[in-house]
């Protein structure tokens, strides 16, 4: 039921997770963990933010986007096969059982042997900046919602196609906004 993302050994992997702050600078604590989202917090925490800043992180894990605007997408630097697995992004919204949690599956492929010395785009740059997520329980299938500028026949396969960085580039360049959930 997890949305799947792919990267090659040696690349940077990008796992998208977003929320919309109620007001600019009115941030919500977020944690990222290796392993599926449990009932509270994140298991095996790799990065955490509070209402102001990133306050806990481990090497190779960082937020490349503007987390003050709700872009809490995780970048994992120089991935190895051991980085494969499920990652939890938890947006810890205050209140009664308000947490939004997302399980994202990272698949690491062995590096391709490329004879030509052409520079590949960084995996992080291959994904659109405007991906917005909405909450689902850990065992639910994440569904695709409103999708401007893309025809309906593409919707059912979009989650799978996001694995292909070329499509992601096209989406970014066309300015499309993707909403999951």
């Amino acid at each position: 039921s997890e949305v799947e993302y792919r990267a090659e050994v040696g690349q940077n992997a990008y796992l998208p997770c977003f929320y919309t702050p109620a007001a600019p600078g009115n941030l919500v604590p977020v944690c990222w963990g290796k392993g599926a989202c449990p009932v509270f917090e994140c298991g095996n925490v790799v990065l955490r933010t509070d209402e102001r800043d990133v306050n806990y992180w481990t090497s190779r894990y960082w937020l490349n986007g503007d987390f003050r605007k709700g872009d809490v997408s995780l970048t994992i630097e120089n991935v190895t096969l051991a980085d494969s697995g499920i990652y939890c992004c938890r947006i810890q919204i205050p209140g009664i059982m308000n947490d939004e949690k997302f399980n994202l599956k990272l698949v690491i492929k062995p590096a391709k042997v490329t004879p030509a010395p052409t520079r590949q785009r960084d995996f992080t740059a291959a994904f659109p900046r405007m991906l917005t997520t909405r909450g689902h329980g850990p065992a639910e299938t994440q569904t695709l919602g409103s999708l401007p500028d893309i025809n309906l026949t593409q919707i059912s396969t979009l989650a799978n196609e996001l694995r292909d960085s070329r499509l992601a580039n096209d989406l970014r360049d066309s300015g499309a906004t993707i909403r999951i959930g």
């Epitope: 449990p38 009932v39 509270f40 925490v45 806990y56 810890q92």
Partner: antibody
């Protein structure tokens, strides 16, 4: 030494309210999620509610969330459970418990429990 | 909601025996499982968390295992102080349900 000490319970009328508390000592209270669990005499354990470190996030058994409120005072190291519109089926021993989860870790369980406080709802 | 089915409901054993208690979850709980022991009139005590990690001070004759939906608690060479009721509890999603308990009695 970690200690969790619940307040006295007692006998209350159906429909009335009661607030129980749990005083923590021997650890940094604000570093831990806390929970209330109840047990009907000679029966099993039932999770009631949880609260995060600073009290900003709470979690309840669905059937209780309209009547029970979990809260905490980190300055006083006290956990509370406010119970309203009490019913006979709320009669139980109420335990406060500390969640083992720690910052940056990945441990899930309740590692310290209070002695329990008995609440009887009866006319 | 995740339901926890614990078996057996009761068990008679002798000192020195080995016993196993099982807990089945109605869905995958990803090893977010704890085991407790409770003696008559006392508070529960944590034995195992994260399915297989022994809590501080718990004797090594206790061990937890399992994954997905199936979990077990094994007690090797039962000691007199091991008799009581055992509960499992998941930490996957709310509500944090417990198993109905296994009463371990002296044969």
């Amino acid at each position: 030494e970690v200690k969790l000490v619940e307040s006295e319970g007692g006998l209350v009328q159906p429909g009335s309210s009661m607030k129980i508390s749990c005083t923590a000592s021997g650890f940094t209270f604000s570093d831990y999620y806390m929970a209330w669990v109840r047990q009907v005499p000679e029966k099993g354990l039932e999770w009631v509610a949880n609260i995060n470190y600073d009290g900003s996030r709470t979690y309840y058994l669905d059937s209780l969330k309209s009547r029970f409120i979990i809260s905490r005072d980190n300055a006083k190291n006290i956990l509370y459970l406010q119970m309203s519109s009490l019913k006979s089926e709320d009669t139980a021993t109420y335990y406060c418990a500390r969640n083992i989860y720690y910052y940056g870790g990945s441990s899930y369980g309740m590692d310290y429990w209070g002695q329990g406080t008995s609440v009887t709802v009866s006319s | 909601d995740i339901q926890m089915t614990q078996s057996p409901a009761s068990l008679s054993a002798s000192v020195g025996e080995t016993v196993t208690i099982t807990c089945r979850a109605s869905g995958n709980i990803h090893n977010y499982l704890a085991w407790y022991q409770q003696k008559q009139g006392k508070s529960p005590q944590l034995l195992v968390y994260n399915a297989e990690t022994l809590a501080d001070g718990v004797p090594s004759r206790f061990s937890g295992s399992g994954s997905g939906t199936q979990y077990s608690l094994k007690i090797n060479s039962l000691q007199p102080e091991d008799f009581g009721t055992y509960y499992c509890q998941h930490f996957w999603s709310t509500p944090l349900t417990f198993g109905a308990g296994t009463k371990l009695e002296l044969k």
